[in-house]
Amino acid sequence: IWELKKDVYVVELDWYPDAPGEMVVLTCDTPEEDGITWTLDQSSEVLGSGKTLTIQVKEFGDAGQYTCHKGGEVLSHSLLLLHKKEDGIWSTDILKDQKEPKNKTFLRCEAKNYSGRFTCWWLTTISTDLTFSVKSSRGSSDPQGVTCGAATLSAERVRGDNKEYEYSVECQEDSACPAAEESLPIEVMVDAVHKLKYENYTSSFFIRDIIKPDPPKNLQLKPLKNSRQVEVSWEYPDTWSTPHSYFSLTFCVQVQGKSKREKKDRVFTDKTSATVICRKNASISVRAQDRYYSSSWSEWASVPCS
Amino acid sequence: RNLPVATPDPGMFPCLHHSQNLLRAVSNMLQKARQTLEFYPCTSEEIDHEDITKDKTSTVEACLPLELTKNESCLNSRETSFITNGSCLASRKTSFMMALCLSSIYEDLKMYQVEFKTMNAKLLMDPKRQIFLDQNMLAVIDELMQALNFNSETVPQKSSLEEPDFYKTKIKLCILLHAFRIRAVTIDRVMSYLNAS
């Protein structure tokens, strides 16, 4: 058993049929010695009396908020949560496996630049009785500070018969140098509680590996005289690290017909303009990627040919 | 990345072309190592990230873009940054800080070159003959060093009398390639910045 927050304790249980469970001794936080009674979850049923209460925690029915009272007055609370371990593996019932980029990916994180700011998100099908807390650091043995905000519900989607909820959090490394070469990964730890179930999830990454630039901005077409060709021009996204001559991007320009089956013409360039043939009803899209370290491509920025 | 690559103009900053070749060569070598040594811990997640140049050179700090010198987090180890001009810019006068930046890059290349050559000698003794260093990568390191045009003491190649542990050597190769790729990215950024200055 360990303390998660003030008066909140996590009981780690091996979860299998007829498991013996854990013996837990609760102590009422009071100088009083006599006339103390214990209840669970605002029930009127008295579980025991005295300054301590010993319970055998085997299942969720044994968890909950234990309260000690004296003469109708509440003295203190202790909330017991359960953390299940099945076949030596901690349960991951609360969050959904996103399976990208690999199986058992519960947390996904992205950064728009090298400033040390990043966003992580996760998915669940649970709509209520849910709470999260996020902690992060650079390295684990001698951790350096990363500050995370509160996790918020960022999207709701319908997936077949199920509703899916996306939560996200923003974090910022306390003292980040965009030009630094990372040798210690960022660690992200998410605590999740659903009803009386506790779970934790972790992710470890280098900012350089989770970079995904915003799409190029101000995408414009300039028709070339007496030609089907157009000059496409764009700019670096505002959120990208500066100076751009040091943090350079490379670009992919794509001409896509109306039908998805039509052949796509693609050109790669380090410049912020390109000349392409604009077909009728086609659209021109441009996306960006770090020129020197191949992390993710940005989403496409698009304009119609006409 | 297998993308069309534009060849630089002859008048361009000469080191930029070499640094681009370097990054391409080390990335290819790392990819090859990860494929060949698939049953060894050779991915970014599995290896310990070590920097053989740590406390010996200060490339990141010495080559910091002017714009980042206002960022205190970038200056925690030294309050210096480069100013434009450099020895690779043909006949232009080199500033003191530029020289420091480029000589730091040169020292990095020299240290990695020695490590790679020593390692290759060991790998050539492996009866499995599983992996060797790409001669192209070693040549590209050499070319960039020549373009940087610094005179420096030659470091003798390390020789070891003991029987090499090939498993450890291959893991060290992965560690070295990961670190060298990160440094090659920094070098490329620096050269690109200088070229634009």
Epitope: K5, L79, T131, K195, L196 | -
Partner: nanobody
Framework: QVQLVESGGGLVQPGGSLRLSCVAS????????MAWYRQAPGKQRELVAS???????NYQESVKGRFTISRDNAENTLYLQMNSLSPEDTAVYLC??????????????WGQGTQVTVSS
């Protein structure tokens, strides 16, 4: 941060029925238990019924068989169905919620109350 709003109270004849509702809004986090309490003039507040996170109800002796507590998780609403009401049930009925938010810790919230009067 968590608001509880009760409704459904009123004047009812002995033997009659009422259904109280309590809607929870705000960042409720993980709710560990919800309960209905009542307070009659000049008397101490007393627990009427409670329901835990697993949906298990509990009743004070005097209301067993007459009152039913239930919770609609999706709507974050607590109900109290009161049948066979007697004048002794006259009181202000208050909704109570206990929960956990990992950013702030354990919390307890009370509603303003809804008046139930049983009289002929």
């Amino acid at each position: 941060q968590v608001q509880l709003v009760e409704s459904g109270g009123g004047l009812v004849q002995p033997g009659g029925s009422l259904r109280l509702s309590c809607v929870a809004s705000g960042s409720t986090g993980s709710i560990t238990s919800m309960a209905w309490y009542r307070q009659a003039p000049g008397k101490q507040r007393e627990l009427v019924a409670s329901i835990n996170s697993g949906g298990r109800p509990n009743y004070q002796e005097s209301v067993k068989g007459r009152f039913t507590i239930s919770r609609d998780n999706a709507e974050n609403t607590l109900y109290l169905q009161m049948n066979s009401l007697s004048p002794e049930d006259t009181a202000v009925y208050l909704c109570n919620l206990r929960g956990l938010r990992l950013d702030t810790g354990l919390y307890e919230s009370w509603g303003q109350g809804t008046q139930v009067t049983v009289s002929s």
